[in-house]
Every structure is written in structure tokens, then in C-alpha cells.
Interface confidence: medium
Amino acid sequence: RRDVAHGILNEAYRKVLDQLSAGKHLQSLVARGVGGSLGGGAGDDAEPLSKRHSDGIFTDSYSRYRKQMAVKKYLAAVLGKRYKQRVKNKGRR
């Protein structure tokens, strides 16, 4: 029984750590904004992606940009869900 209890506590602790880590990660992504070389949110006066990638280092920049946005959306969704769940749980008390 003690082992089971420890297992449950460890799992809960891991989930809290995961949540904190995801929160830090999202905060870090948001702070840095959309990377300049990815062209996200670029205004009319910004250089086109092709020009900024003339050195050919990142030929798959668009897919990386999409991947980055996906990470942001995923983290926002996960954290948003957890926040809503906490609010719901508070309401039940």
C-alpha cells in the first residue's frame, strides 16, 4: 500500500513539474516573440523569407515556423485547459 501511495504521489509530483516546465517554456517562447528569421508577424517592410534565407541555412524555415507555432498553440492549449480545470474545481468547493 505504501508503494502504491508513493507511486501516486510521484505521479502527481511529476505532473506538477511538467506543468511548471510547460509554463516556463511557454513564457520563454512568448517573451522571445516570433523569431525574426521565421517571418512570423512580419509587416510589409520586412524582408521576404527567401531573402533572409539566402545563405541557405534553413531551407525548411516555413515548416519550422509552423512547428514552432504548433508548440506555442499546444502549450497554450494545455495550460489553458489546466487553468480552466482549476477554476472549475474551485467553483465546486
Epitope: S28, A31, R32, G33, V34
Partner: antibody
Framework: SVEESGGRLVTPGTPLTLTCTVS????????MCWVRQAPGKGLEWVGF?????SAYYASWAKGRFTFSKTSTTVDLKIASPTTEDTATYFC??????????????WGPGTLVTVSS | DIVLTQTPASVSAAVGGTVSISCQSS????????LSWFQQKPGQPPKLLIY???TLASGVPSRFEGSGSGTQFTLTISDVQCDDAATYYC??????????FGGGTEVVVK
């Protein structure tokens, strides 16, 4: 290109604003970073202002410096300079994506001397 | 506080030789690879050499090589040239939204 200006000799406690003027890229797309270097010493990261106008500071710099920007300039304000703020201040473009970050474009720097 | 330790503080190298500079962080850099290397000569701004721990910046000779991940990184200069005499700095970028420079390594070319 990136160029700093505004560096001069000031007395301790006299507010000072440094300006970084950029051309050839958009501040709505790129973050800009400030780095300083005391005479004969190493480089020290001060902080950055992101493309959404949010500023982030090194832990030691919070409350001592303020960043702001327009469409083509980024300002660094030293509210109450001390002799320890004597340094060359560099402005650099802070580029990143999920796979890297880099300070890839630097200005020549502007020298601030704080002395009574 | 995060500490980024660069060693050695100074190193002497013969033309054509090899130099290795180490950069050790007390915490993992962001994404395990947000680590850059810069070269600085007196009176000049720093010049980006390596970013993403191992990617060579545009226009930098392939004699410069960056390696490492997480907390331990190395800059290797092979076939050292007189023009490589400078101070080299590593820069770590962290999840706490802070960037920290190493103390610098002076490379003297004989």
C-alpha cells in the same frame, strides 16, 4: 545596420538615454538586445526588447535600466547612473527560432563615462 | 544565479596549430543548444562565429567549430591564423529569459 548614439560623460545620478537606430530590417519582426562592456572587462548582457515591445532585463539590471522603442529606434535609459555603469554600450539584433538564438548584427557601440 | 564558466582565461597558439576553448554552464541552456560564440578584437564590437552550439555564422571560416550540448560546450579553432588573435566569448541563452556571457578567453597567436 545598427548604430548606437548618446554616449557621453555624465555625473553620477544624471539620467542618460542611449539610442540604437536600425535600418534594413523591421523592429516589428526582430528583438533587440543591449550588451555592455566596462573598459578592459568582459561582455555583460543587459536585456532585450522584443518585437511586441515587451522588455526583459538581466536580474542585476532590473530597475536600473528601461528599454523603449519606436519603429526604427530602440532606447536604453539609465535612470540614475553610477560609476559602475561606465562602459561601452552595444545594441545587437537578437534573432531566434525554435532551434537557435543568435546576436547576429551589432552596432559599433557608444561610450558612457560616469564620473564626478 | 546561473554561472557560465569559460576556460582557459588565456591561451597561446602557434600559427597552424589548434586551440580549444571550453564553456561550462551551471544550468542547461535553452533547448540544450542556445549557445553562441563570439570573437572580439580591441575597439570593435563582438562578431558572431557560432550559434545554436554548432552552426557556423555566415562568412565565418570552417576552421572554427562549435560542439556540445546542455551544459558543456567547446569552440575549436584549427589551423590557427594570425588574424585569429582576439578575445572569444560564449553566450548562453536560458529558459528563464536571461542571457549570460562567459568571462572570455584571450587567444594569443605566436
Amino acid at each position: 545596420s545598427v548604430e548606437e548614439s548618446g554616449g557621453r560623460l555624465v555625473t553620477p545620478g544624471t539620467p542618460l538615454t542611449l539610442t540604437c537606430t536600425v535600418s534594413g530590417f523591421s523592429l516589428s519582426t526582430y528583438n533587440m538586445c543591449w550588451v555592455r562592456q566596462a573598459p578592459g572587462k568582459g561582455l555583460e548582457w543587459v536585456g532585450f526588447i522584443n518585437s511586441d515591445d515587451s522588455a526583459y532585463y538581466a536580474s542585476w539590471a532590473k530597475g536600473r535600466f528601461t528599454f523603449s522603442k519606436t519603429s526604427t529606434t530602440v532606447d536604453l535609459k539609465i535612470a540614475s547612473p553610477t560609476t559602475e555603469d561606465t562602459a561601452t554600450y552595444f545594441c545587437a539584433r537578437y534573432d531566434w527560432d525554435y532551434y537557435y538564438s543568435r546576436l547576429d548584427l551589432w552596432g559599433p557601440g557608444t561610450l558612457v563615462t560616469v564620473s564626478s | 544565479d546561473i554561472v557560465l564558466t569559460q576556460t582557459p582565461a588565456s591561451v597561446s597558439a602557434a600559427v597552424g596549430g589548434t586551440v580549444s576553448i571550453s564553456c561550462q554552464s551551471s544550468e542547461s541552456v535553452y533547448n540544450n543548444n542556445y549557445l553562441s560564440w563570439f570573437q572580439q578584437k580591441p575597439g570593435q564590437p563582438p562578431k558572431l562565429l557560432i550559434y545554436g552550439a554548432s552552426t557556423l555564422a555566415s562568412g565565418v571560416p570552417s576552421r572554427f567549430e562549435g560542439s556540445g550540448s546542455g551544459t558543456q560546450f567547446t569552440l575549436t579553432i584549427s589551423d590557427v591564423q594570425c588574424d585569429d588573435a582576439a578575445t572569444y566569448y560564449c553566450l548562453g541563452d536560458y529558459i528563464i529569459i536571461e542571457n549570460i556571457f562567459g568571462g572570455g578567453t584571450e587567444v594569443v597567436v605566436k
